[in-house]
């Protein structure tokens, strides 16, 4: 059956059960993923916005797939095998009473089982296995995967000592060449291109096939993971990095003190809570900020927003939008827009798309 063709996997908790504290839900889900990462080369990271590989949903009855829940008891949860879209997603029946203990239905134990499915495991015939089809409470403090569970998951992904090769670039190939790969932010930095994804960035040196993967924290320990937008003003040796309503300034590859600052200092209205993508055009000395289906234009010389904005992305960038994930400027005439696993080379002089590519086309995939 299907497996994830990468070792770095993201998850997002779409909504929370009212049965438990949010922190307890986060903890139970995190620990459930950890059970599987402990015995494989897989690494899991929680993201709070955007498209995660695995979406965790609490729902009751009919909830958008073929497998409506059945009220209290019976089916507790279900999860889809690896893949795009609904693939990997784990759904928990809100009609159960979810708990951190032996009363009701233990979320951690159920999540371990469902994440097994999300990773590609089927049911086990071993009653001691967490992948056995029926729920049975065991002490979560002494919980262990059975030999059958470990054998099953390692037959799909190998054992954890492969972890030691991450983030060795040679071992980043499966994730990098995944046809569904998308990026959070992309920017040039001198003759390099930085591609940000969760807590990693890939570094592409122009015209060279080799790429390297790094942890953001290894280069900039004070910066968060999940950078959402980035742009460079090369003439000033400056890079701006954005996450949520904050931004950081990097000068000569060093973070400036007194950051992060609020994005509202650029002149955004209060309803703007985050930037999806940003790009600086040195010809016009303007930065374009993309937020949902709109964009703003910022005059870097006068340090203020140009009048008449925001405008709709789709109105002024033919074929682009309605929303974008990332964008960068290159070769004096192109913007490269990223939308999910697709990328569009856009000639801003001709004002049209000149090429459609996969997002990871820069890496010789």
């Amino acid at each position: 059956g299907p497996v994830w063709r990468k070792h770095y996997i993201t998850y997002r908790i779409n909504n929370y059960t009212p049965d438990m504290n949010r922190e307890d839900v986060d903890y139970a889900i995190r620990k459930a993923f950890q059970v599987w990462s402990n015995v494989t080369p897989l690494k899991f990271s929680k993201i709070n916005t955007g498209m995660a590989d695995i979406l965790v949903v609490f729902a009751r009855g009919a909830h958008g797939d073929f497998h409506a829940f059945d009220g209290k008891g019976g089916i507790l949860a279900h999860a889809f095998g690896p893949g795009s879209g609904i693939g990997g997603d784990a759904h928990f029946d809100e009609d159960e009473f979810w708990t951190t203990h032996s009363g009701g239905t233990n979320l951690f134990l159920t999540a371990v089982h469902e994440i097994g499915h999300s990773l590609g495991l089927g049911h086990s015939s071993d009653p001691k296995a967490v992948m056995f089809p029926t729920y049975k409470y065991v002490d979560i403090n002494t919980f262990r995967l059975s030999a059958d569970d470990i054998r099953g998951i390692q037959s799909l992904y190998g054992d954890p000592k492969e972890n030691q090769r991450l983030p060795n670039p040679d071992n980043s190939e499966p994730a990098l060449c995944d046809p569904n790969l998308s990026f959070d932010a992309v920017t040039t930095v001198g003759n390099k291109i930085f591609f940000f994804k969760d807590r990693f960035f890939w570094l592409k040196v122009s015209e060279r096939p080799k790429t390297s993967v790094n942890l953001i924290s290894s280069l900039w320990p004070t910066l968060p993971s999940g950078i959402e937008a980035a742009y460079e003003i090369e003439a000033r040796n400056q890079v701006f990095l954005f996450k949520d309503d904050k931004y950081w300034l990097i000068s000569n590859l060093r973070p400036e003190p007194n950051y992060p600052k609020s994005i509202h200092s650029f002149g955004f209205p209060n309803f703007v809570k985050k930037i999806d993508a940003a790009v600086f055009n040195p010809r016009f000395y303007r930065t374009y900020f993309f937020v949902d289906n709109q964009y703003w234009r910022y005059d870097e010389r006068r340090q203020m927003m140009d009048p008449g904005y925001p405008k709709l992305i789709t109105k002024n960038f033919q074929g682009i939008g309605p929303k974008i994930d990332a964008v960068f400027y290159s070769k004096n005439k192109y913007y490269y827009f990223f939308q999910g696993s697709n990328q569009f080379e856009y000639d801003f002089l001709l004002q049209r798309i000149t090429k459609t590519l996969k997002s990871n086309s820069w890496f010789g995939c």
Epitope: G1, P2, N14, M51, L55, V57, A62, H63, G64, D65, F66, H67, H78, A79, F80, G81, G83, S84, G85, I86, G87, H117, G122, Q339, G340
Partner: antibody
Framework: EVQLLESGGGLVQPGGSLRLSCAAS????????MHWVRQAPGKGLEWVSG????????MYADSVKGRFTISRDNSKNTLYLQMNSLRAEDTAVYYC???????????????WGRGTLVTVSS | DIQMTQSPSSLSASVGDRVTITCRAN??????LNWYQQKPGKAPELLIY???SLQSGVPSRFSGSGSGTDFTLTISSLQPEDFATYYC?????FGQGTKLEIK
């Protein structure tokens, strides 16, 4: 290359029976949910039935429940739809469609056959 | 039960036009919405899955957006081959279809 080829359609009287087949090739048939979707002349698409990779769980639209039976033979890479107690409103082109994955149906149909026409008329 | 309402049911447009078709669910379906194109006498073809992901081989002028209950399919610049009927779909439920005709 994924290919789905339906057969078995034709003219049948109300109350009669018909068995449709769908021969699959170009993918590992036993890994995927499979479905039947129909389209009455000049009308929209209507999902009819789905079957799990093993042939275990099956699902039906309310309009055909108790009259139609979906099955599969993984050794022959073939999907079937046995239609009994046929009614005039069952007249449609019947498509077989491949779901994108198992073990649960994603409800995402990435490949379709060309369809076979079933006409129920006296 | 979940219901899908697609609008408009028909639409006249010209080559080069920008066209938007909407689909609304009566309860949240997260991003579990797909779009198909069907030409007369042919089987439907998958265009967009999971609300916004472009199926391999589909031209980039097609895009999808939305989550929860409201979804849109946009064709940024209509081409002659785009005149067809479009369906939104979530699990076993299809929208009523939108017939896109030449003006």
């Amino acid at each position: 290359e994924v290919q789905l080829l339906e057969s078995g359609g034709g003219l049948v009287q109300p109350g009669g029976s018909l068995r449709l087949s769908c021969a699959a090739s170009g993918f590992t048939f036993s890994w995927y949910w499979m479905h039947w979707v129909r389209q009455a002349p000049g009308k929209g698409l209507e999902w009819v039935s789905g079957i799990s990779p093993s042939g275990g769980p099956t699902m039906y639209a309310d309009s055909v429940k108790g009259r139609f039976t979906i099955s599969r033979d993984n050794s022959k890479n073939t999907l079937y739809l046995q239609m009994n107690s046929l009614r005039a409103e069952d007249t449609a082109v019947y498509y077989c469609a491949k779901d994108i994955r198992g073990p649960y149906s994603s409800g995402l149909f990435d490949y379709w056959g060309r369809g076979t026409l079933v006409t129920v008329s006296s | 039960d979940i219901q899908m309402t697609q609008s408009p049911s028909s639409l006249s447009a010209s080559v080069g036009d920008r066209v938007t078709i909407t689909c609304r669910a009566n309860q949240s379906i997260y991003t579990y919405l797909n779009w198909y194109q069907q030409k007369p006498g042919k089987a439907p073809e998958l265009l967009i899955y999971a609300a916004s992901s472009l199926q391999s081989g589909v031209p980039s002028r097609f895009s999808g957006s939305g989550s929860g209950t409201d979804f849109t399919l946009t064709i940024s610049s209509l081409q002659p081959e785009d005149f067809a009927t479009y369906y939104c779909q979530q699990a076993g439920i299809f929208g009523q279809g939108t017939k896109l005709e030449i003006k």
